[in-house]
Amino acid sequence: GSSPRSGVLLRGCPTHCHCEPDGRMLLRVDCSDLGLSELPSNLSVFTSYLDLSMNNISQLLPNPLPSLR
């Protein structure tokens, strides 16, 4: 379900990634240099920026981030 409207709830931040708010709603997600072989699974729909550099992701399936706008 959708998360309630609140100023005190943190948006979903994938394990081991670093996250930083981007304005009132959005989230910048830095998952660089984590040795990932696939995309992080619990990305917030409010992700405005995603850094996956310096990982081991060799291929992406079609529409790999369906939850993102």
């Epitope: 309630p4 100023g7 005190v8 948006r11 931040c13 994938p14 394990t15 670093h18 708010p21 009132r24």
Partner: antibody
Framework: QVQLQQPGAELVKPGASVKLSCKAS????????MQWVKQRPGQGLEWIGE????????NYNQKFKGKATLTVDTSSSTAYMQLSSLTSEDSAVYYC??????????WGQGTTLTVSS | DIQMTQTTSSLSASLGDRVTISCRAS??????LNWYQQKPDGTVKLLIS???RLHSGVPSRFSGSGSGTDYSLTISNLEQEDIATYFC?????????FGGGTKLEVR
């Protein structure tokens, strides 16, 4: 710089109501939520509720519904919390604090509320 | 409500020590954890959000880690100005809840 100004202390009688104020400056008041937190002497922190000054939307901790009412006056960039039917259990320090995307980045100095006859 | 537990209510350490303060949630909070510092005069400051993101102006000797239900705040080189009470807070679901606090004292 960001400032949240709260009165240092309030003394009220049991059964009465009190309206605590929190005057914000140094930022755009309607761009941030305002949180209210209670701390009893020697105790931890307890979230009371929050208000979005842009449209006065509120969320309350179920425990404080009927006890606390949050409002804002955007013309003076001031947030208020009214506490009703006061008892000694309401004696505490009350903090206002602003938040954005899930974390509370600036806190007021707190108002010490004493309920005593 | 999610319960946040800081098992150590007070901690004594020497200046220069590496200090770790732990916090446990009653359920998985998916890294949605903040740490706050409360000075003896009551002043409260944000240290860390999103489990590990240092707030602007916070010294780099502070760091946060953990996952799932278990999280920790580490001060790598304790200074006099760090003497305070430290609270964790979950931002996973309403109502947000705080740990009981860990009071840090100088040995």
């Amino acid at each position: 710089q960001v400032q949240l100004q709260q009165p240092g202390a309030e003394l009220v009688k049991p059964g009465a109501s009190v309206k605590l104020s929190c005057k914000a400056s140094g930022y755009t008041f309607t761009n941030y939520w305002m949180q209210w937190v209670k701390q009893r002497p020697g105790q931890g922190l307890e979230w009371i509720g929050e208000i979005d000054p842009s449209d006065s939307y509120t969320n309350y901790n179920q425990k404080f519904k009927g006890k606390a009412t949050l409002t804002v006056d955007t013309s003076s960039s001031t947030a208020y919390m009214q506490l009703s039917s006061l008892t000694s259990e309401d004696s505490a320090v009350y903090y206002c604090a602003r938040s954005l995307s899930g974390y509370v980045d600036y806190w007021g100095q707190g108002t010490t509320l004493t309920v005593s006859s | 409500d999610i319960q946040m537990t800081q098992t150590t209510s007070s901690l004594s350490a020497s200046l220069g020590d590496r200090v770790t303060i732990s916090c446990r949630a009653s359920q998985d909070i998916s890294n949605r954890l903040n740490w706050y510092q409360q000075k003896p005069d009551g002043t409260v400051k944000l240290l860390i959000s999103y489990r590990s993101r240092l707030h602007s102006g916070v010294p780099s000797r502070f760091s946060g880690s953990g996952s799932g239900t278990d999280y920790s705040l580490t001060i790598s080189n304790l200074e006099q100005e760090d003497i305070a009470t430290y609270f964790c807070q979950q931002g996973n679901s309403l109502p947000p809840t705080f740990g009981g606090g860990t009071k840090l004292e100088v040995r």
